[in-house]
Interface confidence: low
Amino acid sequence: EVEKTACPSGKKAREIDESLIFYKKWELEACVDAALLATQMDRVNAIPFTYEQLDVLKHKLDELYPQGYPESVIQHLGYLFLKMSPEDIRKWNVTSLETLKALLEVNKGHEMSPQVATLIDRFVKGRGQLDKDTLDTLTAFYPGYLCSLSPEELSSVPPSSIWAVRPQDLDTCDPRQLDVLYPKARLAFQNMNGSEYFVKIQSFLGGAPTEDLKALSQQNVSMDLATFMKLRTDAVLPLTVAEVQKLLGPHVEGLKAEERHRPVRDWILRQRQDDLDTLGLGLQG
């Protein structure tokens, strides 16, 4: 808590400018009007304040807005955002995607901090769902964002938003998450033709049921082994040798290298040895 002291004569700040970097903490507290600071927040970022000075500026804003900052101030917080606690951020009502982008930019290149996680949570809850523009923005800054959400949270993602998802955004998703995302992707891409559809749906197939895998096996998709290995074991087990051969196409030879790993191992154990022999790979059921 900074002590209340009178501002020295002639030091009252008329505007937020570089001269303030020479002010001591108590002088900033005494001589900078909080309302002036709020209206000129966009200037703060261009001034090389110390962390201690930024603490004082934050304190002034906290006093001016005890119920939480207005969006006009939030949008221009810049590096002052790094001084905010999750508790501070929970008081905010952030509705503009531009505000979100501005604050994510400040944290760019770092792992998602508790502050950023809270900000995103506030923003998404305020919007009611993860719309395409929001998802585009979040995955651009945090490719793993989608996979950090619970299945319940993912259920609020509209199918139209799935178009924004890139394969790398799903790299760390668990099967439970893909179980939620796959039906949305299927709906989103349903009007595409066979080969284009497969390119788009491929990353989501970890949530696909057996019947959809059977359907894909009839479309000459040539699924690669990396994709096959991510399929649900319970979805792969009912597939016949012929269906897996059609599904993988020329990649079927890769089954040999993966014969000890799920789902291949479990699938092999379900097959008749005679059927496995037709592949000519030396697989032993």
Partner: nanobody, 125 residues
Framework: EVQLVESGGGLVQPGGSLRLSCAAS????????MGWFRQAPGKGREGVSA????????VYSDSVGGRFTISRDNSKNTVYLQMNSLRAEDTAMYYC??????????????????WGQGTLVTVSS
Amino acid sequence: EVQLVESGGGLVQPGGSLRLSCAASGFTFSRNTMGWFRQAPGKGREGVSAIPYTSTGIVYSDSVGGRFTISRDNSKNTVYLQMNSLRAEDTAMYYCATDRRPGTTMLAVNGYNHWGQGTLVTVSS
């Protein structure tokens, strides 16, 4: 009931190697991300490495990248941490964790619901 049991810790000289294991039970191991964390004496717990169920998208902390390797064997319900070129500053209690929470990064200490009891690694000459 979820159980995580770490092993493989011990005393090793600087530059040496150790392989930690974490045996898991009580949950579907093959559908869960697993993380390794450590806590040095008098310091807070920090993320070391984490491996998703697919073994893609593995992450390492800057301090161990290039020296440590995480891996998993879903058939044995076990996750491993191979530690090479060990330094004195790697001395810590090492914990494995699972059951990732939403809204957290893979190396976030608050990102996991279940933890093991830890295994002590001491690097000293």
